[in-house]
Interface confidence: low
């Protein structure tokens, strides 16, 4: 691949895993035992973007699928979606901004801020089995902190 990537899984700070919910949506729920195999494996690509010491621009693709998390406006609201791309052209170093997230590491936890919509973060609900979404608040009810687990390629 033309861009450096690593394979990983993500869990929110309540240890909920991310799984596919239909063809174009992720949901967060607690998994145990063999059910852990359901969790999605991301191919996290390190891409160009506006970066600083604590913000690293990444793209989050689903491993071996031509799907990437992207941020778009729907009904005037920043929205998280899974977008299908041409696998011949992705991943690439200079990803379109809607695919880029600023990976922010704080106290061994990760936040993923939309590069397209600053201060909007990949979020999960406190409730079980709810969609992963783009949220505009930190520190409230919704969860914006994640941990990353390295997966061998």
């Amino acid at each position: 691949a033309p861009v450096r990537s690593l394979n990983c899984t993500l869990r929110d700070s309540q240890q909920k895993s991310l799984v596919m919910s239909g063809p174009y949506e992720l949901k967060a729920l607690h998994l145990q035992g063999q059910d852990m195999e359901q969790q999605v494996v991301f191919s996290m690509s390190f891409v160009q973007g506006e970066e600083s010491n604590d913000k690293i621009p990444v793209a989050l693709g689903l491993k071996e699928k031509n799907l990437y998390l992207s941020c778009v406006l729907k009904d005037d609201k920043p929205t998280l979606q899974l977008e299908s791309v041409d696998p011949k052209n992705y991943p690439k170093k200079k990803m379109e901004k809607r695919f880029v997230f600023n990976k922010i590491e704080i106290n061994n936890k990760l936040e993923f801020e939309s590069a397209q919509f600053p201060n909007w973060y990949i979020s999960t609900s406190q409730a079980e089995n709810m969609p992963v979404f783009l949220g505009g608040t930190k520190g409230g009810q919704d969860i914006t902190d994640f941990t990353m687990q390295f997966v061998s390629s």
């Epitope: 033309p2 390295f150 061998s152 390629s153």
Partner: antibody, heavy 128, light 106 residues
């Protein structure tokens, strides 16, 4: 001061083994990916392999020319990385360097684009 | 396997601008970096992630990368810049170096 020091080089016969050490100081050793490179006399730089930091499983990658013969490991409690070289060949004769990924890149992926701290190198001569 | 090609030598007069190129297939889609190595010394990183300069590297060093070519530019070249320069990129979890360019300051 951030520093890496290689040791363990010397003269060895073809087919034999040698273990090089890379000792770090002045930084949190376990957080960083570490590389081994080599440079044959009068030649350019050649990558040997690297080991990722603990956050990324300490996994390794190797150049095709050494895969299966060389093994990289690390002992973060001692701030040492090792290069175990088996079945040495005359073409493995070189100065061997270890280095550390760029500070800026540490939190991104534990291996990044560029190495900002290099050791002074240790010479390995494989000859009968 | 992926290859990076550099000119074996480049000459420049003091105070002039030196450009060292590094070519590889779709190199602009990868991150490139550059190392300076003086005789008997370890390499020194001068440019990483195409354009970034580590602390302590003079501003006269700059980098660019697009298409199939990465370029290291040294403006206002000084005698102390005479050295070998190596480009480096990533390809499929491996590190690839160019063959090196000897910069001579006339």
């Amino acid at each position: 001061e951030v520093q890496l020091v290689e040791s363990g080089g010397g003269l060895v016969k073809p087919g034999r083994s040698l273990r090089l050490s890379c000792t770090g100081s002045g930084f949190t050793f376990g957080d960083y990916a570490l590389n081994w490179f080599r440079q044959a006399p009068g030649m350019g730089l050649e990558w040997v392999g690297f080991i990722r930091g603990k956050a990324y499983g300490g996994t390794t990658e190797y150049a095709a020319s050494v895969k299966g013969r060389f093994t990289i490991s690390r002992d973060d409690s001692k701030s040492i990385a090792y290069l175990q070289m088996n079945s040495l060949k005359t073409e493995d004769t070189a100065v061997y360097y270890c280095n550390r990924e760029v500070e800026y890149c540490r939190s991104s992926e534990n291996y990044c684009y560029g190495m900002d701290v290099w050791g002074q190198g240790t010479t390995v001569t494989v000859s009968s | 396997s992926y290859e990076l090609t550099q000119p074996p030598s480049v000459s420049v007069s003091p105070g002039q601008t030196a450009s060292i190129t590094c070519s590889g297939d779709k190199l602009g889609d990868k991150f490139a970096c550059w190392y300076q190595q003086k005789p008997g010394q370890s390499p020194v990183l001068v440019i990483y992630q195409d354009t970034k300069r580590p602390s302590g590297i003079p501003e006269r060093f700059s980098g660019s990368n697009s298409g199939n070519t990465a370029t290291l530019t040294i403006s206002g070249t000084q005698a102390m810049d005479e050295a070998d320069y190596y480009c480096q990129a990533w390809d499929s979890n491996t590190v690839v170096f160019g063959g090196g360019t000897k910069l001579t300051v006339l």
